[in-house]
Structures are given as C-alpha cells and as structure tokens.
Interface confidence: low
C-alpha cells in the first residue's frame, strides 16, 4: 500500500560541476524498517521485469555489496526516518532525476528528486525594495539556491566594484523545505549612490570568484543644487548690484519648481534660476539660498551670506547692571548696527568725552556716586562714523552720606525739657525711608527723621541716629548735656563713728550723687532755722538740746534739692530728776499718795531706785511709788535715782507730810 510512505525533501536541488549536493530528506515507512535502499540516476520502470532500470549510484543490500560509485555518493539516513544523501563531488551528468528505491519487508517505494547541475557556478539573485529614497535605510538581499556542507562558499557585496563597508548578515538553510545561502545588507543610500552598480559576488572558501549578480541603484532624491554669486565674496556696499545663479547638479525624479529664500523666508516673484538684486540696501543683507522641488520634496542650496556694508547706525548703551551699588563693578556695552563691525568707539559721560575709552565695552571696577549719569557712545567703521544715540542712565545706589544728629533745642537743655532731635544727611540713593535711634528710649520713637523726647531725663547722655535706605548709616552720637538740680541729697554722719553721747564732737556731711552744672551751694536747717552754708555741720561739744531733725539743701543754677530729714539723737545720763507727789505733798492718813520720779534721759531710764530721808533705799524700782493707805509715819523727805545705759542721776529731796485724820484726832 503505497500511501504508507511519506517523504519530505526539496523538490529540486541546484549545484555546479565540481561542487557537491546535500539532499535533506525524511521518510516514514509505517509497516517496518527499511530493508533495502538503491539510489538510481534517471530510473525507468521496466514493465517486463517489473523492476526499475537506470544507473545505480548507491546500493545498500542485505549482502552488503557496495559499488565503487558509493565513495562519491553517501546515504546518511537510517532505517525508519532519515533519508539524507550527499554527492561529493557532483558532476554535470548528475543532472536529472534521482530515484530513491526503498524496500521494507512488505512494501516498496520509488521517490524522485530533481537535480540541476550546471557547467559553471550559477549567479546569485539580488532583491531590492520597490523604491529607494536617499537617507532611508533599506535591506539589500542576495539569494543563492545552493548550500552544501562539503563545499563552503561566501557572498560579497561590492559598490562600483569596491567592497561595501557595511556589515552583511549571511544565513544558510539546509532543510527539507529549502536549501539556500542568503546575504542581507542594511544600507542608507545617499543621493550620490543614484545610478551606481551594486554587485553580489559568489566566491569559494578561498575568496576565488565564482559568479555574480549586479543591479543599478535608482535612488530617489530631492534636487541637489549649487549656488553661484557675483561678486564671489558676496560683500557689497549699498547701491551695488548682486547676481545669484542656481544650478541643479542632480534630481530624481526631475524637478518641478524653483524659488529663492532670504533668511528662511520665500522671496515673492522670484521663480527662475537667476536672482538679480539691483541697488541693494543694508536691509537686503542676509542668508540667501535657492530651493528646487521634485516629487520627493524640496532641495535647498547652501546659503550665501550677502553682506551689504554700511556706516554704523545710531548707537545705544546697555548697562550691566543699573542701579549699581557703590563699590560694585559695572560694564557698559556700546551697541550699534554696522557692517563691517565698528573698529573704534568714542564714549561720553554726561555729554563729556571719556578719554582713552575706545573699546566696545567699558568696565568700571569700583563704582562711586559721581559715576552716576548718562552714558552714550559713537561707533566708527571703515565706511564712516555713526551718530550718538540717546544714552543710558546709570543709577548708583549708596548708603546715606554724612549723617548727623542735630539738637533743635536752644542750649542748655534742662531736665524735664522736651528735646527735639533731627536726623540729617547730605545725600542718599535710593531715598531714605526710615530712621533708627540709639539708645532705644521709652519715648515714642517714629520711623521718621525727627525724635521728640518728652520730659528729658537727667541721665540722657548721648543720642545717635541712623538714616536708612537699603542700608543704615549711623551718625556720631551727640551729647545732650542735660542740666539738672543736684541729685540724691542726703545727710551723712562723719563722726563719731558710734552713737552720739552728750559732750561728743559731732560732724555731719551733706552728700549728693551728681549735679550739672557742678557749682553748688549748701544750706543746713533745723526746725526751719538756718544753721550753716558749708558742706559740713560741726558740733564741738554736743548737748541734748542739739538733738532734733536736720535737713541739708544743695542748690545749683537749675534748682535746689533737699535731703530727707535726718534725726540727730544725743545720748545722756538721766538729768533734771524730781519727785512729784499726787494728790499733793500734804496727804491725810488713810488716803493714797503716789510719788513719781520724773527725769530727762536718752535712752529712757531703765531702772529706778527710791530713797528716804535717811538715804535708805526702798524696795521699789518702778517710776511710781504708791503708798496706800498712807500713814503718819510715812511723812518725811524722799528722793529717787534714775539709771540708763549712759549713767545715773538723782533728784533733790521732796518732803511728804501726812497729817492725822479727824477720826484719829477725835479719838485722842
């Protein structure tokens, strides 16, 4: 049953004399393994014998007989799948049909393969894309329907006979589907490649030429142009004439339109290959080119830079930077349209020529206020001198200058006055917007240039102001020199160092902390009575009568200041003691009599002692001696003694008379 044999292999194989052929082949015999294989050349079926006749190139049988031809032909297959064959070398007369006679135990099959062997190596075939455009990458393919393991070959690309630089990718196929060798070349053709010959050359392993295929490149491209100008350097003066000519060196396909452009903008009504410019003006300076279009697109020539020369135009000045800060650096740039460029410049400051400044730029490394003003310049080239433009203003900014603090009041200033100060300055840029004052007082301090100090203090010594724009400038402090009455007047005891005892020598000092003006007078007062006009008050021998409240006054031309009252205390032993009797010095017996020891002492008496007419001390120590009931025997003279920390004093005798009561007299 022939349907059981399935073969796969290329239908036709190609080779040339002396090369080799490799026939990839697979089969399937479902009923069993291959028993016998014969390779026929141009087999013919003989009906009489029911066998195939023809040249046997290879035979594999059970008995193992191998014809001599088998050295050239090799069966590389197996008994159930592979039927690959190799013929090496292959000859011209091997062309025709190869018949593979396959036999298994029960089945037979004849499979035919075409072999085309040429006398010489046949050429490869170059495949091109349908259209090639300049600068667009294309792939060129060179295909050869040949590949054989025993005969290595190579495909080389040539452009106008010269090997191409681009790397080609070669691939081979030896499969049951196809047998070929292919070379692919990626290539970005330029317009100059148009019409050039590309060759794919087949070479053997040693690089020997075998065959080739050639094609002519048809590279579509925009028109390629050349521009010519008279005069050739394209430098003219106003009023001259200029001619430009456009030549097409290549175009594929043919060009259709022509136009001219200046600085990228199309010139109207200029559609010929010649551009005539008559009596040119400086505005016609610029970059000219011609543009020619075809179906691919527009092509442009190189640009011609037409320079129409003219004298400098009125100049302008650019300042880097204004406003400028005093002490900073500033650069001035003179800008003037001219062709050729100016070679010399003249600079002016406030209309006056700046000597030695001939460059396009003027650099001032350290700006001062007097540099402010208008800067202008004049440019000059070979065709003439330009006009001076309007100029530019340099604004120089600086802190307020010569700041002074000025006292507006008539002098002298007295404590308690309202003082007005102003902050003055000579110049400032930008203008002063605020003021600062030092020290920071409790007064209301405006941000303005006038400071009012209400009720000025005696201790306000110096004031300074600052005028501020972007910076603050401080004035030197001014002294207010406030005049005031003497301050902190007080009485101070100089001697004795300890407490004052009666009889001591005593000195009191009138002190004050400060006075402006310094010339002062002193006054001492006790109980409203003037005692002296010196700074000290002296007592040679103090007596208790000198004790009391003392004040001193210090005055100057502004006013006088009193001290606080100072109490002078004199310590003395008890004195002027006397015994007083109540209700009197004559008392009736049985009544009550009180004796009081009166004294003058500082400090007060701390201890009393009572004595009778016999100088006998009585057991009583208080200031009062109470006799109740009083008896006639109590009659007599009494005296008392007082004691303090300074000493003792005694009273004179005082007599108490106690008389009998009527009752007593009645009883007698």
């Amino acid at each position: 049953d022939s349907s059981k044999w399935v073969f796969e292999h290329p239908e036709t194989l190609y080779a040339w004399e002396g090369a080799c052929v490799w026939i990839p082949c697979t089969y399937r015999a479902l009923d069993g393994d291959l028993e016998s294989f014969i390779l026929f050349h141009n087999p013919e079926y003989n009906k009489n014998t029911s066998k195939f006749d023809g040249t046997r190139l290879y035979e594999s049988t059970k008995d193992g007989k191998v014809p001599s031809e088998q050295k050239r032909v090799q069966f590389l297959g197996d008994k159930n799948k592979n039927c690959t064959l190799s013929i090496h070398p292959v000859h011209l007369n091997d062309s025709g049909q190869l018949g593979l006679r396959m036999e298994s135990k029960t089945e037979k099959w004849m499979e035919r393969i075409h072999l085309n062997v040429s006398e010489r190596p046949f050429p490869p075939h170059i495949q091109l894309p349908p259209e090639i455009q300049e600068s667009q990458e294309v792939t060129l393919t060179c295909l050869l329907n040949f590949s054989c393991y025993g005969y290595p070959i190579q495909l080389q690309w040539l452009l106008e006979g010269v090997p191409m630089r681009q790397a080609a990718v070669t691939s081979t196929s030896l499969t049951i589907k196809s047998v070929f060798t292919r070379s692919e070349l990626k290539f970005s053709p330029q317009w100059s490649h148009h019409g050039k010959i590309v060759t794919c050359q087949l070479q053997d392993a040693d690089g020997k030429f075998l065959s080739n295929d050639t094609v002519q490149l048809n590279v579509k491209h925009t028109p390629k142009l050349e521009i010519k100008v008279t005069p050739s350097d394209a430098i003219v003066r106003e009023g001259d004439s200029v001619t430009m000519t456009c030549e097409v060196s290549s175009s594929n396909p043919e060009y259709t339109t022509v136009s001219w452009l200046k600085d990228g903008t199309s010139l109207k009504k200029q559609n010929t290959f010649t551009l005539n410019l008559r009596e040119v003006t400086k505005d016609q300076s610029g970059k000219y080119c011609c543009q020619v279009s075809n179906d691919v697109g527009p092509g442009r020539s190189e640009e011609v830079f037409l320079q129409v020369q003219y004298a400098p135009e009125p100049s302008t000045v650019q300042i880097l930077h204004s406003p400028a800060v005093e002490g900073s650096q500033v650069e001035f740039l003179c800008m003037s349209l001219a062709n050729p460029l100016p070679t010399n410049y003249t600079w002016y400051h406030n209309g006056k020529e700046m000597q030695g400044r001939t460059e396009e730029k003027v650099h001032i490394p350290k700006i001062l206020p007097w540099h402010a003003g208008t800067y202008s310049c004049v440019a000059e080239n070979i065709l003439g001198t330009g006009q001076r433009g309007p100029g530019a203003e340099l604004d120089v900014q600086y802190p307020p200058k010569k700041v002074t603090t000025v006292i507006q009041n008539p002098m002298p200033i007295r404590e308690g006055d309202t003082v007005t100060l102003s902050c003055n300055y000579n110049s400032s840029n930008p203008s002063v917007t605020r003021y600062e004052w030092k020290p920071h007082g409790a007064w209301e301090e405006p941000s303005l240039g006038v400071l009012k100090i209400q009720n000025v203090g005696w201790d306000n010594t110096t004031i300074a102001c600052a005028a501020c724009n972007s910076w603050c400038s401080w004035a030197s402090p001014v002294a207010l020199n406030v005049q005031y009455a003497p301050r902190d007047v007080r009485v101070r005891k100089i001697k004795p160092l300890s407490e004052i005892h009666s009889g001591n020598s005593v000195s009191l000092q009138c002190d004050f902390s400060s006075s402006h003006p310094k010339e002062v007078q002193f006054f001492w007062e006790k109980n409203g009575r003037l005692l002296g006009k010196e700074s000290q008050l002296n007592f040679d021998s103090i007596s208790p009568e000198d004790a009391g409240s003392y004040s001193c006054w210090v005055n100057n031309s502004i006013g006088q200041t009193a001290s606080k009252a100072w109490t002078l205390e004199v310590l003395y032993a008890p004195r002027r003691l006397r015994v007083s009797m109540s209700p009197g010095d004559q008392v009736m017996e049985g009544k009550s009599a009180t004796l009081t020891c009166e004294s003058d002492a500082n400090p007060p008496v701390s201890h009393y002692t009572w004595f009778d007419w016999n100088n006998q001390s009585l057991p009583y120590h208080s200031q009062k001696l109470r006799l109740e009931p009083v008896k006639v025997q109590h009659s007599g003279a009494y005296w008392c003694q007082g004691t303090n920390s300074v000493g003792k004093g005694r009273s004179p005798l005082s007599t108490l008379t106690v008389y009998y009561s009527p009752e007593t007299i009645g009883r007698r």
Epitope: P323, Q397, V432, S447, C468, N469
Partner: antibody, heavy 121, light 113 residues
C-alpha cells in the same frame, strides 16, 4: 529656600523661665533683623521686639522689657528669646519673623511656624 | 503707642460676594518725605503663621491675587476682596510700621456662609 525652624511646644510651671529658639537657613543670617511676635490664644498679635544679628543691637516694646531677652548665635544662625518669671499671662504662641529692607525700603519678611508656650502648675 | 482699630471683628459672607474691612490708626501713618503710608495687611489661616498680603497700604505682595486690594491714607485704611472664595477663610490683621513699637489691629475674622 528661606526657612525659619522654631523649637517645639513648651509646658512650664509658673515662676520658671523658658528659652525659645529659631534656626534660620537659606540666607545670610546677619542681613535680616529677627523680630518676635506674641499671639495669645484667640487674640491678636503683639510686637515684642527685635535683634540685629550683625551687632547684637536690640529694641524692645516697653511692655516686654524685663520679660523677654533676645539673643543670637551667629555660628549656628539661631536666634533665641528667653522669657522669665512666667505667669499664665505668658501662655501664647510666639513667632519669630526675619525682616530685610530691600532697595525700596520695603520689608521682605519670613515667619517661623510658631512655638506654643503653656504656663500651668 | 499708636493704636490700631479694626472693624468689624468678624463677618460671614457667601462665595462670590464682595467684602470690605476697615482699619483705623490713632495717628497718621503717612510720611510726608516719601508720601508713603507705613501700613501692612496680614492674612492668618487657621493653624498657620501670618502671611503678608499688602504693604505701603496698597502694594500687593507677589503671588497675591488681584481680588485683594488695599486702599486708604493717613489714618483710615480698607482691605477689599472683590469676590470671596473658600481659600479666603482667615483672620486679617492690619499693622503699622510708622513708629516703634509696631502695633497690630485686633483682626477681622472672615467666615464663609
């Protein structure tokens, strides 16, 4: 970018003191005066005073003399406000504000995020 | 010290409405030397630091929308918002920097209905 980063919230006892800091970045610390502003809860703003970091000069609102002391540490670009003898009246948010007078005499200003001080026993 | 008084203390408006708030100073803030009014307006949104909107009484800080306009001279000043948006919810303070100590107004609280 100019920033003023103030110290975190403070809870302190009456009679004690507190020091609020304000760290400046993104500019020359000595060019801007550092102002301090008080905002009591739900109330308006009160100007405490300022310090000039360049020379340490200070100016106080009379109301805050003796209460607030302003100082700076130039090396760390930080301004400080020390509040003493604290009472509940001092509970507030305190802001630092950097002010620079430009060419026009107009004050550019940048504010800190504020520091909350709460005085409670 | 210069006393700054603002009115009203609060107001509630709908989005799109026009609003004006007033600020009065106890003495003139106009400096004759440069004819500038030393007055600024600040906006303080909830939980944020104050932000300066206007200085010299009428000059807008960069980035401040032209819906906000400052006007006035001497002692009477006004801040106007021509068409209120939800973004404008804040307290607005005026401040004088004519004389030390600088002082602020009590503020006007703007609420959105």
């Amino acid at each position: 970018e100019i920033q003023l980063q103030q110290s975190g919230p403070e809870l302190v006892k009456p009679g004690t003191s507190v020091k609020v800091s304000c760290k400046a970045s993104g500019y020359d610390f000595t060019r801007y005066n550092m102002y301090w502003v008080k905002q009591s809860h739900g109330k308006s703003l009160e100007w405490i005073g300022y310090i000039d970091p360049y020379n340490g000069d200070t100016r106080y609102n009379q109301k805050f003399k003796g209460k607030a002391t302003l100082t700076v540490d130039k090396s760390s670009s930080t301004a400080y406000m020390h509040l003493n003898s604290l009472t509940s009246e001092d509970s507030a948010v305190y802001y630092c504000e950097a002010i620079y007078y430009d060419m026009e005499g107009y004050a550019l200003d940048y504010w800190g995020q504020g520091t909350s001080v709460t005085v409670s026993s | 010290d210069i006393v700054m008084s603002q009115s009203p203390s609060s107001l509630a408006v709908s989005v799109g409405e026009k609003v004006t708030m007033s600020c009065k100073s106890s003495q003139s803030l106009l400096y004759s030397n440069n004819q500038k009014n030393y007055l600024a307006w600040y906006q303080q949104k909830p939980g944020q630091s104050p932000k300066k909107l206007i200085y010299w009484a009428s000059t807008r800080e960069s980035g401040v929308p032209d819906r906000l306009t400052g006007s006035g001279s001497g002692t009477d000043f006004t801040l106007t918002i021509s068409s209120v948006t939800a973004e404008d919810l804040a307290v607005y303070y005026c401040q004088q920097f004519y004389s030390y100590p600088w002082t602020f107004g009590g503020g006007t609280k703007l609420e959105i209905k």
